[in-house]
Interface confidence: medium
């Protein structure tokens, strides 16, 4: 067992080295380890094959370090890995698209607060078991087409607190099991009419605190299971172009936030849901 760590066998074979001031992944981690806790250290680099010997590893926590680089092959051989927490490593900024390849059993991936500026093509390829993906509080500006295409079992996608300005047509393709999509606190000004086409099981959609002045109801039509919708804190324009959204909200049987109008001035602060159809004049 590495000097700064505690190793024990029950309930699972565990190597625990949190908050020890470690500057590198320690050598000598027992190969039988099922859980490795390395959070709260000063680790800046995860070299290739750092955990290759740990074939039984199911949980790896590297959150709250100072990671600036993760080699593409850092997690090679971890076919049984279920939880990977890389959150709170603000200097990371980018992740090689091959980093998570081969992690076919991964169900939880934390990449929040990592300073990520982009999601490289194929970053989440092959993560068919993934259920929870945490990407909030990064610096993401765009959602590339088909980024999440392989994540057919994903139920929770956290994208809030980024700089995303639009939701393109293919951003959420393949997310057939998604239950909760949090997109609040971004800069979203435009949602493609077909952006949510695959989200037939979505129950919760948070779009509050964005830059939306309009939302095509065609985008909301596929959301057959939707129960919770939050649209507040957006600069909604309540003119005749808002009539389809107004009509959709009247029929919506779930719970929705207020939709306060910004324009025209005479309706500023009024809730779109509570307006009458003939309030929505002029274009």
């Amino acid at each position: 067992c590495p000097g700064a760590c505690v190793c024990y066998n029950e309930p699972k074979v565990t190597t625990s080295c949190p908050q020890q001031g470690l500057q590198a992944v320690p050598v000598g981690i027992p190969a039988a380890s099922q859980r490795i806790f390395l959070h709260g250290n000063r680790i800046s680099h995860v070299p290739a094959a750092s955990f290759r010997a740990c074939r039984n590893l199911t949980i790896l926590w590297l959150h709250s370090n100072v990671l600036a680089r993760i080699d593409a092959a850092a997690f090679t051989g971890l076919a049984l890995l279920e939880q990977l927490d890389l959150s709170d490593n603000a200097q990371l900024r980018s992740v090689d698209p091959a980093t998570f390849h081969g992690l076919g059993r991964l169900h939880t991936l934390h990449l929040d607060r990592c300073g990520l500026q982009e999601l490289g093509p194929g970053l989440f390829r092959g993560l068919a078991a993934l259920q929870y993906l945490y990407l909030q509080d990064n610096a993401l500006q765009a959602l590339p087409d088909d980024t999440f295409r392989d994540l057919g079992n994903l139920t929770h996608l956290f994208l809030h607190g980024n700089r995303i300005s639009s939701v393109p047509e293919r951003a959420f393709r393949g997310l057939h099991s998604l239950d909760r999509l949090l997109l609040h606190q971004n800069r979203v000004a435009h949602v493609h009419p077909h952006a949510f086409r695959d989200l037939g099981r979505l129950m919760t959609l948070y779009l509050f605190a964005n830059n939306l002045s309009a939302l095509p109801t065609e985008a909301l039509a596929p959301l057959r299971a939707l129960q919770y919708l939050r649209l507040n804190d957006n600069p909604w324009v309540c003119d005749c172009r808002a009539r389809p959204l107004w009509a959709w909200l009247q029929k919506f049987r779930g719970s929705s936030s207020e939709v306060p109008c910004s324009l025209p001035q005479r309706l500023a602060g009024r809730d779109l849901k509570r307006l009458a159809a003939n309030d929505l004049q002029g274009c």
Epitope: D137, L182, Q185, A209, D233, S255
Partner: antibody, heavy 119, light 110 residues
């Protein structure tokens, strides 16, 4: 690292007033809703009030409606709770809490500040 | 009196698995977001699980939650003496903007 530090608690007479503060750091304060939650001595947790990130929306438990006012100063990364017409049953440790993953949970908590209402 | 009902106390021995229930009306549980909190003696509460079943970052995999109908539950496996404390469920109703806590359950590890 998210940090929340409450202050302003103390002993006050029934009918009196007190203003609690919660200094926040380690996250973009203006982006997140915040709440106050209290715990009377030896009792359970009770939600008191919440406020949206912008400060434009506020919510109150029935037990404090009309007496307490929640506010925030995003330029100072500080949350406030102005408590007026205090009653003996308001005696509690008051915690500020951050709604980080959305409104559905209290994701980070301060250590709390004790408010005692007694003559 | 809380509208979310928890058992006042639960007792277990080290290594055992215990379950804490949280029950209420259909509207209180089924249509709400349930979260779970741990409060150790003299400390502030700490989030364990949010959005019904999602473990909070840094929380041991010994803690798991489920929700079905009018009941939610928190399971703690491989019990340790350090798990002793109070556990609370909470429900949030989006749209009502109302948060309600259960009465709390005191967990004792013998």
């Amino acid at each position: 690292e998210v940090q929340l530090l409450e202050s302003g608690g103390g002993l006050v007479q029934p009918g009196g007033s007190l203003r609690l503060s919660c200094a926040a750091s380690g996250f973009t304060f203006s982006s997140y809703a915040m709440s106050w939650v209290r715990q009377a001595p030896g009792k359970g947790l009770e939600w008191v009030s919440a406020i949206s990130g912008s400060g434009g929306s506020t919510y109150y438990a029935d037990s404090v409606k009309g007496r307490f006012t929640i506010s925030r100063d995003n330029s100072k990364n500080t949350l406030y709770l102005q408590m007026n017409s205090l009653r003996a049953e308001d005696t509690a440790v008051y915690y500020c809490a951050l709604h980080y993953y959305g409104l559905g949970s209290f994701d980070f908590w301060g250590r709390g500040t004790l408010v005692t209402v007694s003559s | 009196q809380s509208v979310l009902t928890q058992p006042p106390s639960v007792t277990g021995v080290p290594g055992q698995r215990v379950t804490i229930s949280c029950s209420g009306s259909t509207s209180m549980i089924e249509r709400a977001d349930i979260s779970w909190y741990q409060q150790l003696s003299g400390e502030a509460p700490k989030l364990l699980v949010f959005a019904n079943v999602v473990p909070s970052s840094g929380v041991s995999d010994r803690f798991s939650a489920s929700k079905s109908g009018t009941s939610a539950s928190l399971a703690i496996s491989a019990l340790r003496s350090g798990d002793e404390g109070d556990y609370y469920c909470a429900a949030f109703h989006d749209g009502l903007n109302d948060w309600v806590f259960g009465g709390g359950t005191k967990l004792t590890v013998l």
